[in-house]
């Protein structure tokens, strides 16, 4: 199953992925690749870690900005373009035969809206608005953001109307979601 995340052209996309090191500090290699998770490893690798740190990155736009040493291996793609759209594979390479954890996430990059958003709200929507993706094979996916979010099937223009963003910001606060400001 895939969770779908939205980002606007020119902004940063956040694709969540995490595991719990057991015992704490016992890190395992992780790779991020473009495309659904294949049988082995990652194809079209964009970023790779070893047991200590990131050791391979195909572009300076790919970053792990979370607490890598606690198992937060969420991928941030800076300054996204339409070409960044698609499925990404986060593969947690747990030692052993066929032990890897595989997570597919889908990034949808949208063109900038013509309406200028409120300057205080960071336009990194992917963490705040995962949206449900239903496929014939797997059924509905589960979102990874806690709290009851507002309906994500709003029109794109609604996201960028200042009044809507103000309302949305308050709704998110009420739901307990984190609001990041510039």
């Amino acid at each position: 199953s895939e969770v779908e995340y939205i980002a606007e052209v020119g902004q940063n996309a956040y694709l969540p992925c995490s595991y719990t090191p057991a015992p704490p500090g016992n890190l395992v290699p992780v790779c991020w690749g473009k495309g659904a998770c294949p049988v082995f490893d990652c194809s079209n690798v964009v970023l790779r870690t070893d047991n200590r740190d990131v050791n391979d990155r195909t572009s300076g736009r790919y970053w792990l900005k979370g607490d890598f040493h606690k198992g937060d291996v969420s991928l941030t793609i800076e300054n996204v373009t339409l070409a960044d759209s698609g499925v990404y594979c986060c593969r947690i390479q747990i030692p052993g035969i066929m032990n890897d954890e595989k997570h597919n996430v889908k990034l949808v990059v949208i063109k900038p809206a013509k309406v200028t958003p409120a300057p205080t709200l960071q336009r990194d929507l992917t963490s705040a608005f995962p949206r449900m993706l239903t496929t014939g094979e797997h059924g509905p996916a589960e979102t990874q953001t806690p709290g009851s979010l507002p309906d994500v099937n709003l029109t794109v223009s609604n996201f960028f109307c200042e009044l809507q963003i103000f309302t949305l910001t308050n709704e998110l606060r009420d739901s307990g979601a984190t609001i990041r400001t510039a």
Epitope: K34, G35, A36, P38, V39, F40, D41, S43, N44, V87, P95, G96, I97, M98, E137
Partner: antibody, heavy 116, light 107 residues
């Protein structure tokens, strides 16, 4: 330039053994999975086995499990396939390939013939 | 295992014409599909991976499309050097499997 050169093929009787080798150059051998793929006369391609960068994971197609063993030596940039209890149906051209789940570089192959 | 079925088994085409090769998977392989070219006495050559991405050095006349279970390799204008056998291969499901091949021959 990436190069993969196989050796060790030949004629062997059913039940016999052979060890294939593949010498790799032109890329960082220790950074890639490696595979053996074969093609029987008049047939299509068949993936046989592969091995992780550090040798910690090895996978085999069902038809060779328990008979073939894949291994690697990163110090020598070499890949191996030990083939035991060979059968007539193992007759094929065996290719060494760099494995990215798909196979982006291949050797020219070495022919294994199992016949009495 | 995921069975890959290629059609037609043989395709007779004149130089300069378009060739369309089909590959069908018995279950979804997402976009994790590659195409190879094999000529007699030569090693297979990777043409396409990730369903539609051309490998390094592959001419633009080769293109791939499809996802899920239906895939197509198109050669827009066949050159003399393109007459060969073409194989698809899925790498989404265990084990890795190839199609039976399509022979593209001169008409």
């Amino acid at each position: 330039e990436v190069q993969l050169v196989e050796s060790g093929g030949g004629l062997v009787q059913p039940g016999g053994s052979l060890r294939l080798s593949c010498a790799a150059s032109g890329f960082t051998f220790s950074s890639y999975w490696m595979s053996w793929v074969r093609q029987a006369p008049g047939k299509g391609l068949e993936w046989v086995a592969n091995i992780k960068q550090d040798g910690s994971e090895k996978y085999y197609v069902d038809s060779v499990k328990g008979r073939f063993t894949i291994s690697r030596d990163s110090a020598k940039n070499s890949l191996y396939l030990q083939m035991n209890s060979l059968r007539a149906e193992d007759t094929a051209m065996y290719f060494c390939a760099r494995d990215s789940n798909f196979f982006d570089y291949w050797g020219q192959g070495t022919l294994v013939t199992v016949s009495s | 295992e995921t069975v890959m079925t290629q059609s037609p088994a043989t395709l007779s085409v004149s130089p300069g014409e378009r060739a369309t090769l089909s590959c069908r998977a018995s279950q979804s392989v997402s976009s994790n599909l590659a195409w190879y070219q094999r000529k007699p006495g030569q090693a297979p050559r990777l043409l396409i991976y990730f369903s539609s991405t051309r490998a390094t050095g592959i001419p633009a006349r080769f293109s791939g499309s499809g996802s899920g279970t239906e895939f197509t390799l198109t050669i827009s204008s066949l050159q003399s050097e393109d007459f060969a056998v073409y194989y698809c291969q899925q790498y989404n499901n265990w084990p890795l499997t190839f199609g039976g091949g399509t022979k593209v021959e001169i008409k």
